[in-house]
């Protein structure tokens, strides 16, 4: 978790002098509770936006927006703590809006936005906006949270971001798999424009079951430049096991930008349809 271009952070708006600060996610009001605290944020909204760094890289960011409730507690609002928790790693990053002037009611509802938390593809985050000072123990909560799931690199808009392109999102191998005679599979896919090796991982399963009955790995050496964007054809020999008929073929590239952590593509061959076996006709008729 990180912030995008930390130097450009602003939270001031007409009628409010405000500064954005790094936060330890442990505001002072936790340790020294105040008697009077503001109410919670209203209408927390999170959207996926895309922002360029000064170097020209494109990153997905969480666009966080919320409004204030129209009550008197606005007079005791000193700022807000924005927290983003990445759920699979428990990593948390916070920033603090520090109000340098008192808020006053005006003709329209106060609205705040922040779009500098960089998020990763296919990750889930808990986004929380806490009004400051935080409530006294057993006081009414004055925060709002939402769990936000970021699309993966298959998503059309995510595909062109820097983290996705670095993991090989622009490569479309267009995998085809066909079953040949004599327990063989022909795998065909389009090579990318990089002289790097590939690995084909074959996993076979029985019909309607999820434990594998055969696994095989096939190494494909790095193509020469004249082979870039050409089709690569590989024939894999299967184990002759009756019922081991559903095959998953996964292609793992080793691009220089992502090494052994590149996006993998896969294709599946289903078991052949079994023809309905007709009821056997008895060769004698019972007499009763």
């Amino acid at each position: 978790l990180r912030l995008l271009d930390h130097r450009a952070l602003v939270c001031s708006q007409p009628g409010l002098n405000c500064t954005v600060k790094n936060s330890t996610c442990l505001d002072d009001s936790w340790i020294h509770p105040r008697n009077l605290t503001p109410s919670s944020p209203k209408d927390l909204q999170i959207q996926l936006h895309f922002a360029h760094t000064q170097q020209g890289d494109l990153f997905p960011v969480a666009h966080i927006e919320w409004t204030l409730q129209t009550d008197a507690s606005i007079l005791y609002l000193e700022g807000a703590e924005l927290s983003v928790l990445q759920l699979n790693t428990n990593e948390r990053l916070c920033v603090r809006f520090e109000f340098l002037s008192k808020l006053r009611h005006h003709h329209r509802r106060w609205r705040f936005t922040f779009s500098h938390f960089v998020v990763d593809p296919d990750q889930e985050y808990e986004v929380t906006v806490h009004h400051l000072p935080k409530p006294i123990p057993d006081g009414d909560p004055n925060h709002q949270s939402k769990n936000f799931l970021v699309p993966d690199c298959e998503h059309a808009r995510m595909k062109v971001t820097t983290p996705c392109m670095s993991s090989g999102s622009l490569w479309d191998p267009n995998i085809t798999v066909e079953t040949l005679e004599a327990h063989q599979l022909r795998v065909s896919f389009t090579l990318w424009n990089e002289s790097t090796h590939y690995q084909i991982l074959l996993t076979s399963f029985p019909h309607m079951e999820n434990h594998s009955c055969f696994e095989h790995m096939h190494h494909i050496p790095a193509p020469r430049p004249e082979e870039f964007h050409q089709r690569s054809n590989v024939t894999l020999t299967l184990r002759n096991l009756k019922g081991c008929c559903r095959h998953q073929v996964q292609i793992q590239p080793f691009f220089s930008s992502c090494l052994n952590d590149c996006l993998r593509h896969s294709a599946t061959v289903s078991c052949p349809e079994m023809p309905d076996t007709p009821e056997p006709i008895p060769d004698y008729m019972p007499l009763w």
Epitope: F148, L149, D152, E154, A156
Partner: nanobody, 126 residues
Framework: QVQLVESGGGLVQPGRSLRLSCAAS????????MHWVRQAPGKGLEWVSG????????DYADSVKGRFTISRDNAKNSLYLQMNSLRPEDTALYYC???????????????????WGQGTLVTVSS
């Protein structure tokens, strides 16, 4: 322009099933999370279920968990709601709604729903 058209509603007996469909047009369907929202007679709006852009993540209101299944077919620009074990309290006007922003939030919309269908009426009665 964006259009969401629901179908599949009707009168059904308690315990029976119904499948709602929503045909979408006028936007890149597979960019956005989609949702079902309902409004019972004389009541407010209630979020029912949501599904992420590729169908990989689904979420349901507690009142329908285990009975309703949301799905989508991006090739057909369509959203579905399979409703099983229907109860009289499921009687409502069911709306298909598009999330305004990219991404997906559990328990409802990340931002606002910016487009809604006209609704399809589901009546559960014996």
């Amino acid at each position: 322009q964006v259009q969401l058209v629901e179908s599949g509603g009707g009168l059904v007996q308690p315990g029976r099933s119904l499948r709602l469909s929503c045909a979408a047009s006028g936007f890149t369907f597979d960019d956005y999370a989609m949702h079902w929202v309902r409004q019972a007679p004389g009541k407010g709006l209630e979020w029912v279920s949501g599904i992420s852009w590729n169908g990989g993540t689904k979420d349901y209101a507690d009142s329908v968990k285990g009975r309703f299944t949301i799905s989508r077919d991006n090739a057909k620009n369509s959203l579905y709601l399979q409703m099983n074990s229907l109860r009289p309290e499921d009687t409502a006007l069911y709306y298909c709604a598009k999330d305004q922003g990219l991404g997906f939030c559990r328990g409802g919309s990340c931002s606002h729903f910016d487009y809604w269908g006209q609704g399809t009426l589901v009546t559960v009665s014996s």
